[in-house]
Every structure is written in C-alpha cells, then in structure tokens.
C-alpha cells in the first residue's frame, strides 16, 4: 500500500467561452481508495478555491459554470490525490479560456448541385455557425473545413474553407451519391465534431472538371 501516484490535468475545453471543464488522469491508486480535489486561483489572486462542480463533466473532472468563468483571467489549477498513506499533487496548469474553445459543429448544412448554362457544373454548400458562438464580438474568428466522399469510398477528401460559410467544389464523380460534412474551429481553439452527414446525388450528366479546383 502506497500514497497515490501523481495525477495530470490533461484537457480543458469550453463550448463557447462562457463555461469550461477540465479533466484529469489519476496516477496509480496505491491500492487504496483515493480522493481527488481540484483547487485553483485566478491571476492576481492568492485565495485558493475548490472546484465548484465535480459532477457535470463526468468522472475526474471539474466544471466551471457561468458565474465561475472569466475570459479575462488566467486560471492556475492543480489536482490533489489523497489516500490513507499520503498525498500527491499534479503539476500546476494555466488556463486561458480563449485558448480552449471547442465549438459545437456548424448547423444547417445544405448541399446542392448547380448546373449553370454558361459554366461547368459544381457542388455548392452553405452552413451556419454554431448557435452558442457569438461572432459579433469580433475576437472570435471561426475557420471551417469540409469533407466529402462517395458513399462507398473509404477515403475522405477535405477542403479548408477559411472563414467562409459557403463553398464550391468543381470536381466530382458523376452518378455517385456523396456524403458531405463540415466542422469549425476558432483560430486558437479546437476543431468541433463533424456535423451530421448530408447526402447529395450527383447527376449522371455532371461534367467532370479537368482540374480539381475548389472556389470560395
């Protein structure tokens, strides 16, 4: 029987900069029941606080609700593991909420085949940013990535769309049914999950473009 091993806070995420959650990995348990507590202070403070919510984020987590979350202050936190034989502490972790945003997937992905008379046909898609993200503040720039593949293909083809919320793809295989998805990330945050797949049937008379270009 031994004191617990050193835990590690390995992940912090915020869906929208208004709340966030951090997760830790326990070290070895030393063969005894182990209690974990997360304590933190914010920059400029010396007063230590205990995690306000150990439940919402699931096991080995700490959730900071709206009243505990500030975008203007860096959080300094550590986890303490204690059993009957002693304690161990994680390394201190510094968290700036701006840099841990992982948004929900983009919404309302629509995909259409456009066949203008005077130009080659193309696949046109548009989407909306996730509702929880407030883009009006200006500091929040979302970047988008699209992926698509024929229904039975193994490999995805990905396209970076930058800040655009619509996109054209010129090179597709006629007669195939395609799956299309989109995801987003803030410029210094994390990619969202992919949106639910949207299916589109490419007509058999769709003319393949000579060059594999995509246009914003």
């Amino acid at each position: 029987q031994l004191p617990p091993g050193k835990p590690e806070i390995f992940k912090c995420r915020s869906p929208n900069k208004e709340t966030f959650t951090c997760w830790w990995r326990p070290g070895t348990d030393g063969g005894l029941p182990t209690n974990y507590s997360l304590t933190y202070h914010r920059e400029g403070e010396t007063l230590m606080h205990e995690c306000p919510d150990y439940i919402t984020g699931g096991p080995n987590s700490c959730h900071f609700g709206k009243q505990y979350t500030s975008m203007w202050r860096t959080y300094v936190m550590m986890v303490n593991a204690t059993n009957q034989m002693g304690s161990s502490f994680s390394d201190e972790l510094y968290v700036d909420v701006t840099y841990i945003v992982q948004p929900d997937p983009p919404l309302e992905l629509t995909v259409e085949v456009k066949q203008p008379e005077d130009r080659k046909p193309y696949l046109w898609m548009k989407w909306s940013p996730p509702t929880l993200i407030d883009l009006k503040t200006g500091w929040f720039t979302l970047l988008y990535e699209i992926r698509l593949k024929p229904e039975k293909a193994a490999e995805w083809e990905t396209h970076f769309a930058g800040q655009q919320t619509e996109f054209k793809i010129l090179s597709l295989h006629p007669g195939q049914k395609y799956l299309v998805q989109v995801r987003c990330k803030p410029d210094h945050g994390y990619w969202s999950a992919w949106s639910p797949a949207t299916f589109i049937q490419i007509p058999s008379d769709f003319i393949m473009n000579d060059h594999h270009h995509h246009h914003h």
Epitope: F10, M71, Y94, Y190
Partner: antibody, heavy 118, light 112 residues
C-alpha cells in the same frame, strides 16, 4: 517532470534543408501547442510557427511561409521543424517551446544550433 | 508585424539595487478579448529562455517576488526591486496578442 529534448547541432550547406526534432516527455503530448523560436548569434528571438499535436493544425510566421514545415508524431511524442532553402542568415539556435492552455511559452527545449556554411 | 522596442540595451546594476527595463510596442497589445498578452522572459548565459511574467504583471510559478511587471496599451515595464547575482542575463519582452508573435531585442543585465 516536463522535458523537451532537441536533436543535436547540424552544419548545412546553403540551399539544403534541415529537420530539427523536439521529443516531449512528462506530460500528455497532444494536450498543448508546440512552438518554434529561433535566435541568430547575438540576436533576439524570432517566432517561426506553432503546431497543435492533437490534429497537426499549424500556424506559421508569414516570413517563413513556404520554407518552414512543422509536424508532430503522436506515436513518439516528437515535434519537428524543417527549414528548406537554407541561407547563411538561417544560422541560429532553434528552440521548441510548449505553452499551457495559453499563448505564452512555459517550457523550452535546450536549443539546436544550425550552422549554414559553404 | 508588431515591433517591440526595449530600452536600455544594457544595464549594469549593483547587487541589492533596483533595475527597470522598458518595452514599447508599435501597436496596442490589447486583444479583442480584453486581455493584454505581454510577457517577459529571461535568458541566463548559456541557457534557454525562461518565463518570468505573463500577461503584463503575473509572476510565473517559482519566480521571486522581486520581479514585477506593469504597463498597458503600448508601454510596459519590468522592475527588479533588488538585483541579485543570479539575475544576470538578457531580458526579452514578447507579445502574443497579434500573429506573428514577436519579441523585443533584449536588455542585457550585468552586475557591477
């Protein structure tokens, strides 16, 4: 203990490429961005770019765009910085550095001296 | 790119005396999220840089309280209240509000 251990010194010819490695230990490699910063002899520090090892997303200093490639190998917890079309002005110590969930550099590698000389 | 200008270029200080380093940026370092990402690093002779102060005025873990940072907008200062022999090296200010991140040219501090 968090450690960033870099590869050894290199001497390169003008026009060639160099690839510097940075092996991370003591933490979960995919959790934090790795940055590359260089320092020419007797000079200041210059940020080259960064990578998120969890998905290999990169941002580069436009000054180096097209010449620098930053990659990460999750299986070995190692980040790499490759600089191509080397010239004498690229002679410098190249550092990798790690952030927290922040945008400042809390941990630094020991540096790798790259000398470009004909 | 944001240009960071440090003064003085070098500083010779008697142990126990104060020291002050100035850093000026070519544009405001207030991020659109309200934070000011101005940091100070020390590079001791033959070593890699180490973080001293983050976000203008916050001491990093293990940094002695004789180091303090202040300033806002474009003008920032690092103060050492009583210089010790182990404080010798080159001090760099750095901004990470705007990409690319940039550094000042450095201030060399030596002991008289």
């Amino acid at each position: 203990e968090v450690q960033l251990v870099q590869s050894g010194a290199e001497v390169k010819k003008p026009g060639s490429s160099v690839k510097v490695s940075c092996k991370a230990s003591g933490y979960t490699f995919t959790s934090y961005w790795i940055h590359w910063v260089r320092q020419a002899p007797g000079q200041g520090l210059e940020w080259m770019g960064e990578i998120d090892p969890s998905d290999s997303y990169t941002n580069y200093n436009q000054k180096f765009k097209g010449r620098v490639t930053i990659t990460a190998d999750k299986s070995t917890s190692t980040a790499y910085m490759e600089l191509s079309s080397l010239r004498s002005e690229d002679t410098a110590v190249y550092y990798c550095a790690r952030s927290f969930f922040t945008n400042w550099f809390a941990y630094w590698g020991q540096g790798t001296l790259v000398t470009v000389s004909s | 790119d944001v240009v960071m200008t440090q003064t003085p270029l070098s500083l010779s200080v008697t142990p126990g005396q104060p020291a002050s380093i100035s850093c000026r940026s070519s544009q405001s370092l207030v991020h659109s999220n309200g934070n000011t990402y101005l940091h100070w690093y020390l590079q001791k002779p033959g070593q890699s840089p180490q973080l001293l102060i983050y976000k203008v005025s916050n001491r990093f873990s293990g940094v002695p309280d004789r180091f303090s940072g202040s300033g806002s907008g474009t003008d920032f200062t690092l103060k050492i209240s009583r210089v010790e022999a182990e404080d010798v090296g080159v001090y760099f200010c750095s901004q990470s509000t705007h990409v690319p991140f940039t550094f000042g040219g450095g201030t060399k501090v030596e002991i008289k």
